[in-house]
């Protein structure tokens, strides 16, 4: 028998990914990080 | 609030084609995932599904009498068809029109009923 | 198609006492998806019929909380706690897995 129509059974969580860098100073570099959803992961 | 109503022709005869309407209201066609079924059920019988129609018009026919159905929408008046064509006594039942809708925020159950509508086939 | 099967057919009561009907698909209704689309409906005398449980065990709202399913795979069982004059009628098991959708025969829950 074929399956009836049926939604996914997981939810999909849309988040928004952010690239930022920011300038810690001359002799330092930079740090560059990636947060999602609120953490930064990178 | 949610309403679904049946209607019908009430008496018909053999091989004729029979045409249902089920009018909604509380609710829209045109939303996302919301979907309608029609089920009958001959006097003192159990229940048979018998075709269901989505909104974006996928539809799904019970394959025992899929030739002889064609369930069909109209979307802007809210309303839902089901035709039977070559109608015969064992076609004589009560018709009702149930919704269901999918989703992960919907419960995926036929929720609401029409009061159903009598059809009877004689010649 | 997927035969469910309900037993008993017919079931006395007095009020007050606990009900349990059974119902039995023929084989899995485990959906692709990972839910298993096993619901009961209530159908009193000249009404339509009205949802008490959907997938397998989650009551609709507003049914009380004497109603209680559970089950898996091709077993299910509905179980009212305690029986009140109001939950009289025939109650219907239901897959909504597989094509055709199918019901059980029904089971009349009636008094001794």
């Known amino acids: 028998d074929a399956e009836f129509r049926h939604d996914s059974g997981y939810e999909v969580h849309h988040q928004k990914l952010v690239f930022f860098a920011e300038d810690v100073g001359s002799n330092k570099g930079a740090i560059i990080g990636l947060m999602v959803g609120g953490v930064v992961i990178a | 609030q949610v309403t679904l109503k049946e209607s019908g022709p009430g008496i018909l005869k053999p091989s004729q084609t029979l045409s249902l309407t089920c009018s909604l209201s509380?609710?829209?066609?045109?939303?996302?995932?919301?979907?309608v079924g029609w089920f009958r059920q001959p006097s003192g019988k159990g229940l048979e599904w018998l075709a269901h129609?989505?909104?974006?018009?996928?539809?799904s026919y019970n394959p025992s009498l899929k030739s002889r159905l064609t369930i069909s929408k109209y979307t802007s008046r809210n309303q839902v068809f089901l035709t039977i064509t070559s109608v015969d006594t064992a076609d004589t039942a009560t018709y009702y029109c149930?919704?269901?809708?999918?989703?992960?925020?919907?419960?995926?159950?036929?929720?609401?009923w029409g009061q159903g509508t009598s059809v009877t086939v004689s010649s | 198609d997927v035969l469910m099967t309900q037993t008993p057919l017919s079931l006395p009561v007095s009020l007050g006492d606990q009900a349990s009907i059974s119902c039995r698909s023929s084989?899995?209704?485990?959906?692709?998806?990972?839910?298993?689309?096993l619901e009961w409906y209530l159908q009193k005398p000249g009404q339509s019929p009205k949802l008490l449980i959907y997938?397998?065990?989650n009551r609709f709202s507003g049914v009380p909380d004497r109603f209680s399913g559970s089950g898996s795979g091709t077993d299910f069982t509905l179980k009212i706690s305690r029986v009140e004059a109001e939950d009289l009628g025939v109650y219907y098991c239901?897959?909504?897995?597989?094509?055709?959708?199918?019901f059980g025969a029904g089971t009349k829950l009636e008094l001794k």
């Open positions: 239901f897959q909504g897995s597989l094509v055709p959708l199918t």
């Open positions: 997938k397998v065990s």
């Open positions: 149930a919704r269901r809708q999918l989703g992960l925020r919907s419960i995926d159950a036929m929720d609401y």
């Open positions: 509380g609710f829209s066609l045109s939303t996302s995932g919301m979907g």
């Open positions: 084989q899995s209704i485990l959906h692709s998806n990972g839910n298993t689309y």
């Open positions: 129609i989505w909104w974006d018009d996928d539809k």
